[in-house]
């Protein structure tokens, strides 16, 4: 099933092309399905999903998170601010998705699909935000050193990092999906 298509949603071949908001909605749901599959492997492989030591590892990560000031929540919603936050957040997640690439055995293709689908999603959203102020892109040098640092962690921390990235990315996408439905 191609990125952005969900087998249970595939409609008749004569249907008109998807509009931008439809593509975005389907793309996010496709990525969320991928994350679910990756989380399943992670949770089967270790006990990280039940661990109470998450906070320790979370302190070392700077994973994008929705905050009130980002304007993506029901109270204080702001379409422009929120759209910028979603795109910026996804761009920041890219280095963490790169880290995930060598972290899966049976779901290696799924990890690649999540990464590539996220790149496509960013392109969709950038088109939607073409009239907004410039969106800051993470510094490649900083990303490279972060990746090196993450890959140098011990096994326990790498497992925990994988778990936290997937959980945070899922929460970020779910918040984005709800917000985008008011756009």
């Amino acid at each position: 099933v191609p990125p952005g298509e969900d087998s249970k949603d595939v409609a008749a071949p004569h249907r008109q092309p998807l509009t931008s908001s439809e593509r975005i909605d389907k793309q996010i749901r496709y990525i969320l399905d991928g994350i679910s599959a990756l989380r399943k492997e992670t949770c089967n492989k270790s006990n990280m999903c039940e661990s109470s030591k998450e906070a320790l590892a979370e302190n070392n990560l700077n994973l994008p998170k929705m905050a009130e000031k980002d304007g993506c929540f029901q109270s204080g919603f702001n379409e422009e601010t929120c759209l910028v936050k979603i795109i910026t957040g996804l761009l920041e997640f890219e280095v963490y998705l790169e880290y995930l690439q060598n972290r899966f055995e049976s779901s290696e293709e799924q990890a690649r699909a999540v990464q590539m689908s996220t790149k496509v999603l960013i392109q969709f959203l950038q088109k939607k935000a073409k009239n907004l102020d410039a969106i800051t892109t993470p510094d490649p040098t900083t990303n490279a050193s972060l990746l090196t640092k993450l890959q140098a962690q011990n096994q326990w921390l790498q497992d925990m990092t994988t778990h936290l990235i997937l959980r945070s990315f899922k929460e970020f996408l779910q918040s984005s999906l709800r917000a985008l439905r008011q756009m």
């Epitope: 908001s21 204080g76 439905r181 008011q182």
Partner: antibody, heavy 120, light 111 residues
Framework: EVQLVESGGGLVQPGGSLRLSCAAS????????MSWVRQAPGKGLEWVSR????????YYADSVKGRFTISRDNAKNTLYLQMNSLKPEDTAVYYC?????????????WGQGTQVTVSS | NFMLTQPPSVSGSPGKTVTISCAGT?????????VSWYQQLPGTAPKLLIY???KRASGITDRFSGSKSGNTASLTISGLQSEDEADYYC??????????FGGGTKLTVLG
């Protein structure tokens, strides 16, 4: 308490124009996408137009495309529908509706409607 | 504009169960979980009953339930009461960023 109060309806000749307004209160107006839905006398409901929460995106039914314009003023908590080149088939009660938060295409609050009659 | 297909009328006795169907295509009802149902009492604005196919709106009794199979959605009203007498409309997202409504079904509670 959520309230949506429409105004601006009336009798207009074919080819004429009208501007409908919807005053919203009891919720954070700028957080919600909004729509106009109409109901011809004794007929069913017909979706007319939608506008995103910040007014960036607008959508129209084919039957009104190019003639109607939806807009909003979040500072005034007001939704508008500018109707030009009106036709007799545009005669209906026009409802201002709110989209449910985080749900696609479900309308959780409706105004009481304003009557638009297009007749010579 | 495109319209979803509903039966013009249904009826049932108090305490009984009635089901209203809403037939569409793979471009609307069958496209995703974007079906909602509305109740319109005489002379009033419509009211949301069900959204996302089967989720009840706030304050709606569990006598109302929704389901979907393929390109057809259904609204089931159990334990019919006289105050349920109204017009019922289904609505669905339609590809192309439109919404489609059904033609409406008039429910009559007998007796």
């Amino acid at each position: 308490e959520v309230q949506l109060v429409e105004s601006g309806g009336g009798l207009v000749q074919p080819g004429g124009s009208l501007r409908l307004s919807c005053a919203a209160s009891g919720f954070t107006f700028s957080s919600y996408a909004m729509s106009w839905v109409r109901q011809a006398p004794g007929k069913g409901l017909e979706w007319v137009s939608r506008i995103s929460s910040g007014g960036i995106s607008t959508y129209y039914a084919d039957s009104v495309k190019g003639r109607f314009t939806i807009s909003r003023d979040n500072a005034k908590n007001t939704l508008y529908l500018q109707m030009n080149s009106l036709k007799p088939e545009d005669t209906a009660v026009y409802y201002c509706v709110r989209y449910a938060w985080g749900v696609q295409w479900a309308f959780d609050f409706w105004g009481q409607g304003t009557q638009v009659t297009v007749s010579s | 504009n495109f319209m979803l297909t509903q039966p013009p009328s249904v009826s049932g006795s108090p305490g009984k169960t009635v089901t209203i169907s809403c037939a569409g295509t793979s471009s609307d009802v069958g496209y995703g979980n974007y079906v909602s149902w509305y109740q319109q009492l005489p002379g009033t604005a419509p009211k949301l009953l069900i959204y996302n196919v089967n989720k009840r709106a706030s304050g709606i009794t569990d006598r109302f339930s929704g389901s979907k199979s393929g390109n057809t959605a259904s609204l089931t009203i159990s334990g019919l009461q006289s105050e349920d007498e109204a017009d019922y409309y289904c609505a669905s997202y339609r590809t192309g960023d439109n919404a489609a409504f059904g033609g409406g079904t008039k429910l009559t509670v007998l007796g």
